[in-house]
């Protein structure tokens, strides 16, 4: 669709005569008829196939024609067409004398014709005017012409319809050739696909408007390049969605089981060495001079009562020192200078001479001890607490503080590790000397039967188009991570590709 435009500029008829040579009375009141038609090697009468237009009376005899287009007038003359411009044409311009006001062809005498010109040739679509001048023996006509496309039509033949738009069916303007020029932020054949945020992951992200990055299921982050770990994952990470790969020292399905209590909590005090001995279980090996489950108690070297025969013990920086009572000497006051004659046995102890009276021995009554029966019996000296239990004097009695995993009066009973029901998913627990063992039912594995192995939703390869399948352990379902160009819960649908359907 386009318009052939003809701009009449000047008509010269100095003698004011008709084509017949007869003069006009009082002068030639001139109007024009224009016929536009298909190309003819010899322009002949016949239908004006591309259109026709007439002017009102524009002047008398010789006159210049005013450009009247800005005022909505008839110059340039418009000959619209609703077809592809063929690039060639024939043009007939007739100048007529109007004796009266009726300009219809049937109202004019045939000899009212002043002049007739006919041209033909090639004409490309464009903004530039072609200037032409046709002269006969009596008249001269100067004019120019061009072909331009109608609004929204483009191309060499005005055959390409293009309307700029900015809605969800396209965001574009039209180029001179009718091709689309996408507005910033849009791409695709019809400029309806937004250009996502720079760096937005091609497979894991998408967008509905420019500079946006929306994440597909299982992905997060500004650029959708961070996987979302399994729901409830505590101390773990993922490299693909819904994983829960435990950090060092953590275990279990959700990495919430502490396998490295020593590192995470540092329970051992005073420079003691910590050893992990199971989930949330540990053992502290104390440095010399310290005791307690966590080596939190400072141990006085006099606490073991090393001084014999009533010697008193004094703590020193590098050990201890025994102050011996009269008649005794030695590091621990173990050597005596006394005999039974000196009545060395206290608390009712009976004295027995040894080595021909050079030495003696006291036989102590119950509840007393020591070489001179000078000490009340310390019920802890016999180390009655088994399995590393700590003995504590409580007046006339004693008690044992047991290490984790042991119980009983003397810590002689091994606490069943199975009492806590540590085996998940119905696993059977077996107590062992150094811990426990779980026998897992079908479909589960791991130290505590915490790992599902049987129901693998991905086993049936449900994902299409080389998508990656992930099993969601919490729901026994699968999630397909689609490669670029595919969508759908199984990645079964191509994106943006010409569909292979017969419509």
């Amino acid at each position: 669709s386009g318009v052939f435009q003809l701009q009449l500029q000047e008509f010269i008829n100095e003698r004011g005569v008709l084509a017949s040579g007869r003069p006009c009375e009082p002068g030639c009141r001139t109007f024009f008829r224009v016929c536009l038609k298909h190309f003819q090697a010899v322009v002949s009468p016949g239908p004006c196939t591309f259109g026709t237009v007439s002017t009102p009376v524009l002047g008398t005899n010789s006159f210049a024609v005013r450009d009247d287009s800005s005022g909505g007038g008839r110059n340039p003359l418009q000959l619209p067409f609703n077809f592809t411009w063929p690039g060639t044409f024939s043009l007939i311009i007739e100048a007529w004398h109007a004796p009266g006001d009726d300009l219809r062809p049937e109202a004019l005498p045939p000899d009212a014709l002043i002049s007739k010109i006919a041209i033909q040739g090639s004409l490309a679509v464009g903004q530039n005017w072609l200037l032409d001048e046709q002269t006969s023996t009596l008249t001269r006509l100067r004019y120019s012409y061009r072909v331009i496309c109608s609004d929204n039509y483009y191309g060499d033949n005005c055959s390409r319809l293009c309307k700029k738009r900015n809605d969800h069916f396209g965001h574009y303007v039209c180029q001179p050739d009718g091709n689309l020029s996408c507005l910033p932020g849009w791409t695709g054949e019809y400029c309806q696909q937004p250009i996502c945020l720079s760096g937005c992951h091609e497979q894991n992200g998408y967008c509905s408007k420019p500079a946006e990055c929306l994440c597909r299921p299982g992905w997060q982050g500004r650029l959708c390049n961070e996987c979302i770990p399994h729901n409830g994952c505590r101390h773990g990470t993922c490299s693909t969605p819904w994983q829960c790969t435990c950090d060092e020292g953590w275990g279990g399905l959700f990495c919430d089981q502490d396998l490295n209590y020593c590192t995470h909590h540092s329970p051992c005090k005073n420079g003691a060495t910590c050893s992990n001995s199971g989930q949330r279980s540990y053992t502290c090996t104390c440095r010399p001079g310290y005791t307690g489950v966590d080596c939190e108690l400072e141990l006085s070297e006099c606490d073991s009562n090393p001084c014999r025969n009533g010697g008193s013990c004094k703590d020193q920086e590098d050990g201890y020192h025994c102050l011996c009572p009269p008649g005794y000497y030695g590091l621990h006051c173990e050597h005596s200078t006394l005999s039974c004659a000196d009545s060395p046995c206290f608390n009712g102890g009976s004295c027995r001479e040894r080595n021909q009276g050079a030495n003696y021995a006291c036989e102590c009554p119950p509840n007393f001890t020591g070489s001179n029966c000078e000490k009340k019996v310390d019920r802890c000296t016999s180390n009655p607490c088994a399995n590393g239990g700590q003995c504590l004097n409580r007046g006339p009695s004693r008690m044992c503080r047991c290490r984790p995993g042991f119980t009983g009066t003397y810590c002689e009973l091994h606490v069943s590790d199975c009492a806590r029901n540590p085996c998940a998913h119905g696993g059977t627990c077996h107590d062992l000397e150094n811990g426990l063992m779980c026998t897992c039912p079908a479909g589960f594995s791991g130290r505590r039967c915490e790992v599902r192995t049987s129901i693998d939703a991905c086993a049936s390869s449900p994902c299409f188009n080389r998508a990656t399948c992930y099993t969601d352990l919490s729901t026994d379902t699968f999630v397909c991570n689609c490669p670029y160009g595919f969508v759908g819960s199984r990645c079964e649908f191509p994106v943006g590709l010409p569909p292979s359907f017969p419509w």
């Epitope: 609004d151 695709g188 309806q192 509905s208 929306l214 359907f501």
Partner: antibody, heavy 121, light 104 residues
Amino acid sequence: EVQLQESGPGLVKPSETLSLTCTVSGGSISSSNYYWGWIRQPPGKGLEWIGDIYYTGSTYYNPSLKSRVTISVDTSKNQFSLKLSSVTAADTAVYYCAREAVSFGGGADSWGQGTLVTVSS
Amino acid sequence: SYELTQPPSVSVSPGQTASITCSGDGLGDKYVSWYQQKPGQSPVLVIYEDSTRPSGIPERFSGSNSGDTATLTISGTQPMDEADYYCQAWDSESGVFGSGTKVT
């Protein structure tokens, strides 16, 4: 050839929510070449565009209905749905789902057969 | 809101030409689609992008659009063409239908 089929209750009480689903067969709802729309026609009256949706979930609504309309898409089921809340007798109409082609300048080249929804107590 | 106006009815004799107009502000700068709807049936797209016929639509259907008016022309009208005809255009992000014209 692509086919569209509307489904949902034919009778809805005033003030309740109208819910319809359109199932697409013979073609993928995930094609980048189409939007999927809802159009309605009250008995004896003309067509009224309700809104449409792209496979990514982008939605566009008639401004006069926007506050009451929700359109959603389920690419795994090849379906899209319409919800119209707080309905009145004026919402009684035949509801059509249609495919709007980007390459046709938005012209709807395929339509469902339509389903009559009556709003009445 | 944007409005498209159509004459309520157009009568035509078989074999003659029927012209249905659709007017709206600056309509010539928008793409217009035309739909045919027969009683009890779903609409059918007969013209898109002002003047393009989808495959399967007879050549007697043609369209044009300039200024503020789009026109659907049915040349050599047949009895089977008796139906309601709706024009449609897009204004911003919203679809707009004309009021419909009954061709008898």
